[in-house]
């Protein structure tokens, strides 16, 4: 059913003829009765409903409701009557010394273990028994030696299996042996890929949940965007910027008649698109719905640009960041292009893709030079560090999954798609394929999928971002697909602009206020920066024409 609060405003004494009156006097549409949603908020619309026959994969609540079997005994009451968490349902009873504990917790006489008859409801009393092959005498039982399981269940906390020599303790699903005898809970959530987004561990179970703005697809158990418009994928093919709706799959040209566009990014909240043209050596911006009109395309940066191959928009602090493989620099500017400064001009060989995390204050970039690597630093250019430097050759595209805190990249020489966490740990090679990753270039992540462009295949592919499986072609015959971004409000979560929280406008900075990386609770929220021709003064806020070169941001 829909939102219960929409079905009748507040308590009402009389309900309409096509409405159901709840015990608490709320009115809801009659069709919401017995739909397994607590629309009344007191469960009265779900009481006295005809008993349903639940699917084999479901648990039947005492009141007839059906819930997923795996939700039983997970510490949360999903049955309206709480029967999925009741003692009767959940207690794995401790069996007596002369009894055997079945996998489902019930007890049978230990003498019935391995008697070739199923005495436990789940048949676990016959699991792990040694069988004598049939002979001309018939299927005889083996001569009984000492069965240690008959006494105190062999000391096993759960399942005791008698062997020809000795015995063995085992555990029901969701548990593991801690000390050869005692079963303890398996923390399935230690596997970062156990769930699409959030993993909650319970005793003997685990449960997947979704972040706000997402809801679980009951079929695939993946988290899908619940809010807003359907996501679309925007990509450049050098001469155009195009858009594919990921759900409706309609295809449109956003910006025609371009010269040599490789890099682009978006600002979702303002509906703006940003792109770099390598031939014109300019960075542009436009509103998406007007971007096809050259008169609506604003030039943001048109000086001291050589080869802007990577571009990223900080949607929180309203900055753009770009790499320049010709100048061998990484720079930042306000989104209107009015104020800019170079953050890095040293130790860059072939900088290409760049991505930002404004929530934590970091940026990440790839460099496919001789010593190929992926690096990160604060959005203000401090705390530069290398994340990946081994088993990496031509890292073209990089992208961030802010929810799982992982960076994904494609390597067009190794034909690989890999991921790593934001600290540089838990590296995973998801796909290695000369077919699907012939010459990958751009990469993007959304929901449970990773998307990438491939220049040789002239296609856009997608795959499961957790395991690299379910590879499929989103679109083909695309002629030079380069950079890609996903356009959806959940890709750019709102956050506070630290520079605007200050009492002074622009954080008191004379020129640029840049967010600082949030490494600890003591980290500064921002630092000030100056244009390339000026230096930051001793007050760390104002800019001066002369000064000590060491204080210059661009020398980092």
């Amino acid at each position: 059913a829909a939102d219960p609060l929409l079905g009748g405003q507040g308590p009402a004494k009389e309900c309409e003829k096509d409405q159901f009156q709840c015990r608490n006097e709320r009115c809801i549409p009659s069709v919401w009765r017995c739909d397994e949603d607590d629309d009344c908020l007191d469960h009265s619309d779900e009481d006295d409903c005809p008993k349903k026959t639940c699917a084999d994969s479901d648990f039947t609540c005492d009141n007839g409701h059906c819930i997923h079997e795996r939700w039983k005994c997970d510490g949360e009451e999903e049955c309206p009557d709480g029967s999925d968490e009741s003692e009767a349902t959940c207690t794995l009873g401790t069996c007596h010394g002369n009894e055997f504990q079945c996998g489902d917790g019930t007890c049978v006489l230990a003498i019935k273990r391995c008697n070739q008859e199923q005495d436990c409801p789940d048949g676990s009393d016959e699991a792990g028994c040694l069988q004598v092959p049939p002979t001309f005498l018939g299927n005889r039982r083996r001569p009984r030696g000492l069965n240690e399981c008959l006494h105190n269940n062999g000391g096993c906390s759960h399942i005791c299996t008698d062997l020809k020599i000795g015995f063995e303790c085992t555990c029901p699903a969701g548990f593991q042996l801690l000390d050869q005898k005692t079963c303890g809970d398996i923390d399935e959530c230690k596997d970062p890929d156990a769930c699409s987004q959030i993993c909650v561990n319970y005793k003997g179970y685990f449960k997947c949940e979704c972040y706000p703005g997402y809801e679980m697809d009951l079929l695939t158990k993946n988290c899908k965007a619940a809010a807003g418009k359907s996501p679309s994928l925007i990509f450049t093919n050098r001469h155009e910027v195009r858009r594919i709706d990921l759900v409706k799959r309609n295809y449109s040209r956003l910006i025609p008649m371009l010269k040599n566009v490789v890099a682009l990014d978006m600002e979702v909240a303002t509906n703006r698109i940003y792109w770099c043209d390598l031939s014109y050596r300019k960075i542009y911006s436009a509103y998406m719905d007007k971007a096809s009109d050259p008169k609506e395309q604003e030039v943001l940066i048109d000086e001291q640009l050589h080869s802007p191959e990577g571009l990223a928009v900080d949607w929180v602090h309203k900055h753009i960041y770009w790499t320049d493989s010709g100048n061998k620099t990484i720079s930042v500017a306000t989104v209107d292009g009015g104020r800019r400064c170079t953050l890095f001009s040293r130790n860059l060989s072939e900088p290409r893709a760049i991505a930002v995390d404004p929530l934590q204050g970091f940026m990440y970039w790839s460099d496919w030079g001789n010593q190929a690597k992926i690096e990160k630093s604060g959005l203000n250019g401090v705390d530069r560090q290398t994340l990946v430097s081994d088993n990496i050759e031509w890292p073209n595209g990089i992208t961030l999954d802010l929810l799982s805190q992982r960076l994904y990249w494609v390597d067009s020489k190794l034909h690989q798609l890999s991921s790593i966490d934001f600290s540089g740990g838990n590296r995973k090679m998801l796909i290695s394929s000369t077919d699907f990753l012939s010459h990958p270039f751009g990469i993007a992540v959304f929901e449970d999928k990773v998307f990438w462009t491939d220049l040789e295949n002239e296609a856009i592919f997608s795959a499961n971002r957790l395991n690299g499986l379910e590879i499929s072609i989103l679109a083909e015959n695309l002629n030079n697909p380069h950079d890609i971004v996903i356009f959806h409000e959940l890709k750019q979560p709102r956050a506070a602009d630290a520079c605007k929280l200050s009492v002074q406008p622009n954080g008191g900075c004379e020129y640029l206020c840049l967010p600082a990386p949030q490494i600890s609770s003591h980290s500064p929220k921002y630092t000030c920066a100056c244009p390339d021709t000026m230096w930051l003064g001793p007050d760390m806020k104002r800019c001066y024409r002369d000064g000590n070169e060491d204080s210059k941001m661009g020398s980092t």
């Epitope: 829909a2 697809d217 899908k224 619940a226 807003g228 418009k229 359907s230 709706d245 990921l246 759900v247 409706k248 799959r249 309609n250 295809y251 449109s252 499929s472 072609i473 679109a475 083909e476 015959n477 695309l478």
Partner: antibody
Framework: QVTLKESGPGILQPSQTLSLTCTFS??????????VGWVRQPSGKGLEWLAN???????FYNPSLKNRLTVSKDTSNNQAFLRITNGDTADTATYFC??????????????WGQGTSVTVSS | DTVLTQSPALAVSPGERVSISCRAS??????MHWYQQNPGQQSKLLIY???NLASGVPARFGGSGSGTDFTLTIDPVEADDTATYFC?????????FGGGTKLELK
């Protein structure tokens, strides 16, 4: 089981507004990725895509008829609607509604109604 | 609009293999679908996105092609395959249908 059924006026006069209803079951237009499309077929001729509406209320209209078409939905009653203003004899056709599946199905019409015949005649 | 061209009619004997072609006036990527239409019956989706068999459709039906040239194949043809077959693209706006190919059995 997915079923769709179209209903309409049958006969109407030129310049009148043609109102069509598609009543469906087996799916919901609240469900992510679902849409309902309208297609027509003049007798003995080919099919023409008129309009469609998606779960998120996004609408598409065929540009050749755009200013005459309005598509809408009533999700609680599992219905979709099409209005064509200023009816003309060229609008005489069988009108179909069909379910559209997005994502990997790619906008194909995977379930159709039987169609309802509309004649515009003075 | 993207024009889809189909040959109007084909005649084939039961048990044979038949190929029905659909040519697009511009690239439609892989977003080509095929339908079967019989008078008085609901149209039926056979193939979606060039080569994917729709649910409940016999494996005798197959699809292939890319870019602008696409083919629906029935092998072997059976008596109740007599129908009109339409192609449809959903890559370019507006979505368009081919004129249909009427399949008759000899």
């Amino acid at each position: 089981q997915v079923t769709l059924k179209e209903s309409g006026p049958g006969i109407l006069q030129p310049s009148q507004t043609l109102s069509l209803t598609c009543t469906f079951s087996g799916f919901s237009l609240n469900t992510y990725g679902m849409g309902v499309g309208w297609v027509r077929q003049p007798s003995g001729k080919g099919l023409e895509w008129l309009a469609n509406i998606w779960w998120d209320d996004d609408k598409f209209y065929n540009p050749s008829l755009k200013n005459r078409l309005t598509v809408s939905k009533d999700t609680s009653n599992n219905q979709a609607f099409l209005r064509i203003t200023n009816g003309d004899t060229a609008d005489t056709a069988t009108y179909f509604c069909a379910r559209i599946l997005g994502e990997d199905i790619g906008g194909a019409l995977d379930a159709w109604g039987q169609g309802t015949s509309v004649t515009v005649s003075s | 609009d993207t024009v889809l061209t189909q040959s109007p009619a084909l005649a084939v004997s039961p048990g044979e293999r038949v190929s029905i072609s659909c040519r697009a006036s511009e690239g439609v990527n892989s977003y080509m679908h095929w339908y079967q239409q019989n008078p008085g019956q609901q149209s039926k989706l056979l193939i979606y996105r060039t080569s994917n068999l729709a649910s409940g459709v016999p494996a005798r039906f197959g699809g292939s092609g890319s870019g602008t040239d696409f083919t629906l194949t029935i092998d072997p043809v059976e008596a109740d395959d007599t129908a009109t077959y339409f192609c449809q693209q959903s890559w370019n706006d507006p979505p368009t249908f081919g004129g249909g190919t009427k399949l008759e059995l000899k």
